[in-house]
Structure formats: C-alpha cells, structure tokens
C-alpha cells in the first residue's frame, strides 16, 4: 500500500494509473466503500462523501491513463485509505494528514518559549524535527518546546515530520520581538546634544503600545522616570516628560530621544521599555551616558568622565601631537601646572578613541579658552 | 493568500534562450500544478506548458521541442527556458496556478525580442 | 488540439446592458470549460469554471452556461468595471487552449 503524508490545509494528489493510455471509467472510494469521485464519459461525477466540495480531478490526465484525486484544505480527519478502482483493478493509497502549529502568536517576546503542537491522525507515530534560523535542531514526538527565544530565533523554523520512512516538512514563520541592541553607550562632552536611538529588530504592519524610560543617574540615588510615552501604528506620542532634562522625542520609528545637553548630573544608565499591545511582558533596552569635562582652574587643568564606565577605559591628558602627560585607569585625571598649547583628553579602550575633548591653556598671563 | 511572483530578462536577441522564474507563496505548492502562458501583443492567450512538485511535466505540441520547465521545491520556485527565440516569441509571459483552471496569476513579464 | 472559436470579437454595450458571449468548442469538452475577464495591462482573472460554477468573490451578475460544444457567459447588467475582454478555455485535453477573446467596449 502507498503511503502519501499531507499537510493541513493544504491539496494533496492522489494517483492512480492504467496501464492504457486513455480515458476510461474508474472511481475513487474512502475506505468505507463511500464513493468519492468518478467519472462517467468525459463528466467528472461526485458521491455522497464529506469531502464532496474539496475532492477534484484532473480531465486533461484521464486521456494519459492517469486519474488523480486531490484532494484540497486538507483535515486531520482525511487520513483514511483511498481506493481507486480502473481495470478492474484496485490501488489503496494511504494518506496521513499531519499539521503543525505554534500554540501561542508566532510573535513572541525576547526570552519567552515557544511551543510547537504536531496535530497527526489516530495510529500515527511520527517524530519531527526543527531547524531554527540559526541552524540549532531540536527534536521531539507531538510538542517540541525552546526556551528564552533569542533575537537569531527570528525567522523560518523548518520542520520535517517522519512517518512511514516518508517525510513532509513544515515551514513556520516566527518573530521575535526585541530591541535590535540589548544595550548601548553614548559618549558625549558636556554641552553637546545627545542623541539616542532604539531601533526595533523586527517590522510589523500595526504596532502599538506604551514605553517608559527609566533613568538612574550616577550621581544620583535613586532612578526617576523621564519620559512616557504611547505608540500607535508606528506613530509616537509623548504622554509626559520631566522638566529637568526636557527630553524630546521623534513622532516616527525608530525611538527617537534627544537630550539638548550632556550633562555631568545626566550621566547615567537608562532602561527602555515598551509594553505591546496584546502581548505579556516588555521590550528592554539599556542605554549609557558618559559625559566628558576639561576644565583649567589656576594651575591644574583636569579631565573628567562621568557614568558607566568599564574598569579597563583609559582616561589621558596630553598635549596635542606628544606623548600623553597622564594616563589612567580612573574617572578623572589632572595635569599641574600645564605648559601652553591645545591638550587633549581622551577617553580610549585598547587604544580606540571613544571620547576627546580639547582644551586651549594659555601663557599664565592669559585665562583659558575652551574651544 | 496565493501569490505568484514572477521575473527574469525582458529583451532578448533572436536565437537566443528566454529564462523566466514564478516564486509561489501563501498556499499549497505541492497539490498543484504551474503553468506558463503566453499572450503576443493584441492577442490571445496560448498555453505553453506545466509543471508539479515532482517534476511532471506537460507542454504544449507546438512548443514542445524547445521548452524547459523546472522546478525547485524547496524554494517554491518553478522556471521556464524557451530556447532559440525569434520575434515571433514576443508576448507577455504569465505563470499561473492550475488543476483543470488557472485561478492565480504571476503579473507578467514582457519579454521582447528583437536584433 | 481542441479548437475554441468565441464570437463575437467585440460588442459595444452600455452600462445596464445585458451582454451575452458564447464559445464553440470542437470536439465536445463535456462542461470542462472555463471564463477569464482581462482588462488591459493586466492578468486575466478567473471568472466561471466547469462551465456553470461562480469562482469565489465573483459578482453574481456573471453566469455561465452550456455543455459539450456550445457555452455562455452571461453578464445580466453590466457595470463600468466589466469593459474588458473575455477568454473562454477548455479543461478537457492537452494542450490547454483559449478561445480568441472577445472584448466589451462602452457604446
């Protein structure tokens, strides 16, 4: 017997062939003996059975000897043995229906699970086997389950169902929601606009909910909220903003905040977060403010850092084209009596310049210019 | 919902080979079969010839010997290659779904041949 | 090949107008036949099959009818958006083939 494997919802094609080349009489039954479909002459002709208005034929193959019946929005329930019969003679044909789904929104949240439920007929014993995007297979019987979905888990899961040493592979689309960076720095001097984007790691037609960002500024003891905001069909909304720093924000995606200046008590660390609509949990993003200072008072002329900095970022002070006068592994870093010239400080990690700001000291006669 | 895409080269010189590709999705492919159709300027619809899932084809007499028709399943792709092309093969090319009718289209190609 | 001769070719009409096109096929194609609208620049769009049977989404202005050689396609009231051309094609053998079109013009 033929074992043919289907997909739910969607046309499957039966075959069955005579050994002449022609049209002739055959019919098509379920194995109840219910007759499905014939023919009679050139006249396709349908029986009682419940797959009357999805069970079709081909006219052009009969006259090849060939008279399929497909069968179209295939159902679980259609697994049965199909008979046709031409020649006076019978071919069975076994066809299972199998289909697989993912039993929550195939948008799911960074770090949620998903689940795929295999739907198969009674006596059936299949296994499946997923790939993901990233190529990690997972295996299993009737649900296969991953856990804390990561932004890489976006895309195509093909799934392969085996049963009857036949295969049939399923392709599931699967979103996963997410900030495109989990976190980010901006490095500014003091004074300059700050900008900071939070762009989105997927795209869909209607996007709507609420965000918040949380700031915790270092010198500062406990975090505050600076702004709130609604989304709506990708347009956005500030619902309420503090006063101090008066942040604004872009109508349109990406998020789009702007801080009209870095300021030393702005340093910090934020947290972003955007509540969808109809979905449980939140997207996160973390974002940094470090904000540089050179100033001159008298005769020391310092270089400061502010915020979240790593332990191994390198503050200098040098003065422009020589070698650098200090360099530190700390937030702040001085220089007595500074000879006259532009100098230069630099925030650096492994020799990459992150941040510089100039400063201009003057002969001591004069008071200094900061560019 | 069923669509078909469809591309591939628009102008052509005389005996050379016409290649077209039809990407099929949002439906079944493989209970199917795909069909390629031709309509030259100001005229009818002439069928050229079909394909299913398993590589079975079918094609039409007049065209048959120099006609290709492939398939590539995994991508739910299906091409047609018409060797040695002359003016007489200048039309719109349609891909098209088919059982007994060709209830979805590819929105064409004009394929224009000429020295 | 299984010939199939539409007539007329063309038919002016006005809006409101019952419009009638038939299609001879030969030899007999038993009811394997279809009805195609095309309007200019576009893919045709299936309208009938089986002779008889509504595609889905199809205004119910548009009937088919006939069995064997003769076939109509029968628009009760035509509306703006039906000017077009028409194409009927048989189902019944290799090579699938098309009637020659008859196109619906404003009077």
């Known amino acids: 017997k033929k074992v043919v494997l289907g997909k739910k919802g969607d046309t499957v094609e039966l075959t069955c062939t005579a050994s002449q080349k022609k049209s002739i009489q055959f019919h098509w039954k379920n194995s109840n003996q219910i007759k499905i479909l014939g023919n009679q002459g050139s006249f396709l002709t349908k029986g009682p059975s419940k797959l009357n208005d999805r069970a079709d034929s081909r006219r052009s193959l009969w006259d090849q000897g060939n008279f399929p019946l497909i069968i179209k929005n295939l159902k679980i329930e259609d697994s049965d043995t199909y008979i046709c019969e031409v020649e006076d003679q019978k071919e069975e044909v076994q066809l299972l229906v199998f289909g697989l789904t993912a039993n929550s929104d195939t948008h799911l949240l960074q770090g949620q699970s998903l689940t795929l439920t295999l739907e198969s007929p009674p006596g059936s014993s299949p296994s499946v086997q997923c790939r993901s995007p990233r190529g990690k297979n997972i295996q299993g019987g009737k649900t296969l389950s991953v856990s804390q979905l990561e932004l890489q888990d976006s895309g195509t899961w093909t799934c392969t169902v085996l049963q009857n040493q036949k295969k049939v592979e399923f392709k599931i689309d699967i979103v996963v929601l997410a900030f495109q960076k989990a976190s980010s720095i901006v490095y500014k001097k003091e004074g300059e606009q700050v900008e900071f984007s939070f762009p989105l790691a997927f795209t869909v037609e209607k996007l709507t909910g609420s965000g918040e960002l949380w700031w915790q500024a270092e010198r500062a003891s406990s975090s505050k909220s600076w702004i709130t905001f609604d989304l709506k069909n990708k347009e956005v909304s500030v619902k309420r903003v503090t006063q101090d720093p008066k942040l604004q924000m872009g109508k349109k995606l990406p998020l789009h905040l702007t801080l009209p200046q870095a300021l030393p008590q702005y340093a910090g660390s934020g947290n972003l977060t955007l509540a969808l609509e109809a979905k449980t949990g939140k997207l996160h993003q973390e974002v940094n403010l470090v904000v540089m200072r050179a100033t001159q008072l008298q005769k020391n002329l310092t270089c400061e850092v502010w915020g979240p900095t790593s332990p191994k970022l390198m503050l200098s002070l040098k003065l422009e084209n020589k070698e650098a006068k200090v360099s530190k592994r700390e937030k702040a870093v001085w220089v007595l009596n500074p000879e006259a010239g532009m100098w230069q400080c630099l925030l650096s990690d492994s020799g990459q310049v992150l941040l510089e700001s100039n400063i201009k000291v003057l002969p001591t006669w004069s008071t200094p210019v900061q560019p | 919902q069923v669509q078909l895409q469809q591309w591939g080269a628009g102008l052509l010189k005389p005996s050379e080979t016409l290649s077209l590709t039809c990407a099929v999705s949002g439906g079944s492919f493989s209970g199917y079969y795909w069909s390629w159709i031709r309509q030259p300027p100001g005229k009818g619809l002439e069928w050229i010839g079909e394909?299913?899932?398993?590589?079975?084809?079918n094609c039409n007499p007049s065209l048959k010997s120099r006609v290709t028709i492939s398939v590539d399943t995994s991508n739910n792709q299906f091409s047609l290659k018409l060797s040695s092309v002359t003016a007489a093969d200048t039309a719109v090319y349609y891909c098209a779904r088919v059982l007994n009718y060709f209830d979805y289209w590819g929105q064409g190609t004009l394929v224009t041949v000429s020295s | 090949d299984i010939q199939m001769t539409q007539s007329p070719s063309s038919v002016s009409a006005s809006v409101g107008d019952r419009v009638t096109i038939t299609c001879r096929a030969s030899p007999d194609i038993a009811n394997w036949l279809a009805w195609y609208q095309q309007k200019p620049g576009k893919a045709p769009e299936l309208l009938i099959y089986a002779a008889s049977s509504l595609q889905s989404g199809v205004p119910s202005r548009f009937s088919g009818s006939g069995s064997g050689t003769d076939f109509t396609l029968t628009i009760s009231s035509l509306q703006p958006e039906d000017f077009a051309t028409y194409f009927c094609q048989q189902a019944n053998s290799f090579p699938l083939t098309f009637g020659g079109g008859t196109k619906v013009e404003s009077k």
């Open positions: 394909i299913n899932h398993s590589g079975s084809t």
